[in-house]
Interface confidence: low
């Protein structure tokens, strides 16, 4: 067969769908690999072909589009399952071709089982809500394209195992779930089950997401450097180990990049010829405020090193701060005989 541009197995798009539910899967060629869309390809006389490799098999085989009730069908650049079965799991390939052109990509599809509490191996998207921030909503995700707006599905929301009704601060409103005032107790997994009729059958779409209540932007402050500070002096003798922690508190800020770094005499540690190591640890509060600690360490400090300026810097979307550590050379304690001798004017 003639050469085909093979984009390989696109594991970035590991698709997971629930067993016994409809699934619509777009050919990734048009989404991520080619610069034209399906309509353009179709108008140009290109044909989209689908095939698959079953789980734990090597053999590529055509997809059976002649199953009862059109269980699997292709519509434009979408592969439809109405509904999926567990043994639909495998690697699916869509190939766009004519006599002179060929391009294909494969992607893994995993059909996943869920229990009666919606627990499953499905990777869950995380939706962050601000703590005590007023009304916030989450929307039942990835149900676009299954039915037009003229269809009125039934939507039921669950928190964990429990149907959401008469909850204090959580109100189902169709495709949306409203949180009147989000609290830490609202953390958890939320599931919407969308039920709609199609061609004499009733289908269900189950979508679960994790809600995480995080710090509110109302309470957000610039980074706070707890250490170094003015109360601690790092006094060392040459040859000792110098350890200076830089501990910074960052308020939670959506999509903010929190950074901590040291400068030594105004330079990054990498740009200076001393044997310095920096170890970082990060911890989070329940509302995802972040504490970063960077410990600057010089194994055997020299008197030159003890004269340098050590400054901890921190930056977030709220601003940038810096604090110098107080470092000095320990003055050796005077020896008793010398002091006495000097005192009596002995020579």
């Amino acid at each position: 067969s003639e050469r085909c541009d093979d984009w390989g197995l696109d594991t970035m798009r590991q698709i997971q769908v629930f067993e016994d539910e409809p699934a619509r899967i777009k050919c990734p060629l048009f989404e991520h690999f080619l610069k034209f869309n399906y309509s353009t390809a179709h108008s140009a006389g290109l044909t989209l072909i689908w095939y698959w490799t079953r789980q734990d098999r090597d053999l590529e085989e055509p997809i059976n589009f002649r199953l009862p009730e059109n269980r699997i069908s292709k519509e434009k650049d979408v592969l439809w399952f109405r509904p999926t079965l567990l043994n639909d799991t495998g690697n699916y390939t869509c190939m766009l071709r004519n006599t002179t052109y060929c391009s294909k990509v494969a992607f893994p599809l995993e059909v996943v089982q869920k229990d009666s509490c919606f627990n499953s191996p499905m990777k869950l998207p995380v939706h962050k809500l601000y703590i005590e921030y007023g009304i916030q909503r989450i929307t039942c995700p990835n149900v676009d394209g299954y039915f037009p707006s003229s269809v009125k599905p039934t939507i039921t929301w669950y928190m964990g195992c429990y149907k959401i009704q008469n909850f204090n601060n959580v109100i189902p409103e169709g495709m949306n779930l409203s949180f009147l005032i989000a609290l830490i107790s609202n953390n958890g997994n939320y599931t919407c089950v969308v039920t709609y009729p199609e061609n004499g059958r009733t289908f269900h779409l189950t979508r679960t997401l994790t809600v995480k209540v995080v710090g509110s932007p109302k309470n957000a402050v610039p980074p706070v450097i707890h250490s170094p500070n003015d109360h601690v002096v790092y006094e060392k003798e040459p040859g000792e180990e110098l350890l200076i922690p830089c501990t910074v508190y960052f308020s939670f800020l959506m999509d903010s990049r929190n950074e901590v770094w040291w400068t030594i005499d105004g330079k990054k540690p990498d740009d200076i010829t001393i044997d310095v190591t920096i170890n970082e640890s990060i911890s989070h509060s329940r509302t995802e405020d972040e504490t970063r600690t960077q410990i600057l360490s010089i194994k055997k400090v020299t008197s030159e090193d003890l004269k340098r300026s050590y400054v901890c810097h921190a930056r977030s979307a709220k601003g940038e701060v810096a604090k110098a550590a107080k470092v000095k050379q320990k003055v050796p304690a005077p020896r008793y005989t010398v002091e006495l001798a000097c005192g009596f004017g002995a020579t």
């Epitope: 399906y38 394209g145 039915f147 707006s149 003229s150 009729p197 199609e198």
Partner: antibody, heavy 119, light 111 residues
Framework: EVQLQQSGPELVKPGASVKISCKAS????????MNWVKQSHGKSLEWIGH????????TYTEKFKDKATLTVDKSSSTAYMELRSLTSDDSAVYYC????????????WGTGTTVTVSS | DIVLTQSPASLAVSLGQRATISCRAS??????????MHWYQQKPGQAPKLLIY???NLDSGVPARFSGSGSETDFTLNIHPVEEEDAATYFC?????????FGSGTYLEIK
Amino acid sequence: EVQLQQSGPELVKPGASVKISCKASGYTFTDYYMNWVKQSHGKSLEWIGHINPNSGSTTYTEKFKDKATLTVDKSSSTAYMELRSLTSDDSAVYYCVRRIGKNWHCDVWGTGTTVTVSS
Amino acid sequence: DIVLTQSPASLAVSLGQRATISCRASESVNFHGTHLMHWYQQKPGQAPKLLIYAASNLDSGVPARFSGSGSETDFTLNIHPVEEEDAATYFCQQSIEDPFTFGSGTYLEIK
């Protein structure tokens, strides 16, 4: 064979109400939306609204919100439309229509019920 | 609401010739690649009957001389060759959005 059999013609006085029926046969009644459409004499078709026979939930166009009420009786596979506060503008043929999924078109139409409002 | 403008309001076509009816929507009826535009035929004293669904799909039992085409906002119903029994009013309808709306109708007369 899929059929929608509607009740007979109605002659009603202005201000009165009328309830017309649509009996479905040949398919599972609760699996398809039931729509209602109005056709005034010599005019085009106007969508009134639909009902999900399974849940009983309804959607109406703005124009018919205070005019029509859609209900179903699942046990007899019958859909009903009640029209209230009738005026001469309500004189028309009313159709019940089954709506099919995926492309949401109207594949089976009822026989039609003629409502005449006259004093 | 989506407004459907049908043209012409009426046309007369000789037996065996082609009849072309247009329907323009005030906004796109493209639903993820499927165009939710449908065509119905209505004869006097009868209920409308589905001819074409989703722009170009012939309903079962409808003769192959009927065909539909178009995309986004512009759609066409073609009848070729026209037969005596095709004398009727033809309506287009969209189902992408509530409320469903219909065109004003085109009356086809056979000469």
